[in-house]
Interface confidence: low
């Protein structure tokens, strides 16, 4: 119960707090459990105890092991254990799972990524931040105190984020890095009565006989994941699949785009080799969700050939 896992990289600073808490006035003794050897408090040592904190400045792979801390008060003693593992630095970019701190989730409204364990260190701003080993650049990223803020979070922002800072101890500087995964979750979405962006109601589209023509039905339904949203075309009030004209087809699949955070769908109607009789049909763009159905009607008209008279 009073055991804590801690990890770090060789040649970086690592500071571990005793899992048992006590008043600042209580003394804390630290021991290396395997040998029961007391950890010194003198700061000239590479590994030393400083009250509730155990400091590795810097850490070495050989420091790995279980450390015991005993919080002593006039009336009781409390014992805790710190399981410390120091890893060799990876030569490649991948951060293994065992070096990862807890995953955090963000959304459009809340995109703070806190640098893990930083409160234990004596550091000064600014923090450096990396995503998948690349330094973060651009106005969307703001290092603010001990956390990173990402503006206009998108699903592509998910990934592994590493913070890097300098710990200062008696004038000596030590590097520290910590990595955690960031996932992007949908804001609580909402759905609205469908809004058709294209075509305009009662639009007349000019087409050339014998050429191909495309009509796009585009509608938005709300924000976030939509339980049900569909965009489709009808010909004279009949589904395309039932109309039976192989020259006129809907584009398979619907592209869900998020424009300004809105969930929108497009459906393209492709008319091959436009014929005179196509001009007589009524083309309905239908957008529907659980709020209801909206319909915009389009008709085709013959595009007059351009005159080339001098």
């Amino acid at each position: 119960k009073f055991s804590k896992q801690s990890w770090g990289l060789e040649n970086e600073a690592l500071i571990v707090r005793c899992p048992r808490q006590g008043k600042p006035s209580y003394t804390v003794d630290w021991y290396y459990s395997q040998t029961n050897k007391s950890i010194p408090t003198q700061e000239r040592n590479r590994v030393f105890a400083s009250g509730q904190l155990l400091k590795f400045l810097p850490a070495a792979v050989a420091d790995s092991g279980i450390y015991t801390c005993i919080v002593r008060s006039p009336t009781f003693n409390r014992t805790g254990y710190a399981n410390v593992t120091i890893y060799k630095k990876q030569s490649d970019c991948n951060v293994p799972d065992y070096l990862m701190y807890s995953t955090v989730s963000g959304s459009e409204k809340n995109s703070k990524i806190y640098c893990p364990t930083i409160d234990l260190y004596n550091w000064t701003a600014p923090l450096e931040w990396f995503k998948n080993c690349q330094a973060l650049q651009g106005s969307r990223y703001r290092a603010h105190k001990s956390f990173l803020v990402i503006d206009n979070v998108m699903t592509e922002d998910a990934g592994d984020y590493t913070c890097k800072f300098i710990h200062n101890e008696n004038g000596a500087n030590y590097s520290v890095t910590a990595t955690r995964s960031f996932t992007v979750k949908d804001e609580q979405g909402f759905s609205l009565f469908p809004v058709i962006g294209a075509p305009a109601q009662n639009e007349i589209k000019e087409v050339e006989i014998g050429k191909n023509a495309n009509l796009t039905c585009s509608a938005c339904f709300g924000k976030g994941t939509q339980f049900l949203a569909a965009v489709l075309w009808q010909l004279n009030g009949t589904k395309i699949t039932d109309f039976g004209e192989p020259r006129i087809q809907q584009e398979e699949g619907q592209n869900q785009s998020f424009s300004n955070g809105l969930a929108c769908l497009d459906m393209v109607l492709r008319i091959a080799d436009v014929k005179e009789e196509d001009l007589l049909l009524q083309y309905d763009c239908l957008a529907l969700n659980l709020h209801g159905l909206r319909r915009h009607t389009v008709r085709l008209s013959r595009k007059n050939p351009i005159d080339h008279h001098s």
Epitope: S191, F227, L288, L290, H291, G292
Partner: nanobody, 117 residues
């Protein structure tokens, strides 16, 4: 707000049929768009079928040709007729209703459909 109660779920063999009912109270379902959703164990809730006040229907690709949604305004009940059932149709089926001036769904408690031999 409309209250929804589903019924008709149960155990059925592959290839069999079931008819789910969604009885509404509190409001007339003619004011609402009705939908059926399902949630299989460990999966997210997914859309199955919807029916609009004008009688227009829409189905998820996975159930097209097998499931039929309908509504009887006089009984204030929506139905989901499920034919040619498959093991992958096993799920809790939920009825949902939403009015055009609302941004939230009203949900039933769900009815379990198990397709197994």
């Amino acid at each position: 707000e409309v209250q929804l109660v589903e019924s008709g779920g149960g155990l059925v063999q592959p290839g069999g049929s079931l008819r789910l009912s969604c009885a509404a109270s509190g409001r007339s379902i003619s004011d609402y768009t009705m939908g059926w959703f399902r949630q299989a164990p460990g999966k997210e809730r997914e859309f199955v079928a919807g029916i609009w006040s004008g009688g227009y229907t829409h189905y998820a690709d996975s159930v097209k040709g097998r499931f039929t949604i309908s509504a009887d305004n006089s009984k204030n009940t929506a139905y989901l007729q499920m034919n040619s059932l498959k093991p992958e149709d096993t799920a809790v089926y939920y009825c949902a209703a939403v009015s055009s001036n609302s941004e939230t769904f009203d949900w039933g408690q769900g009815t379990l459909v198990t397709v197994s031999s």
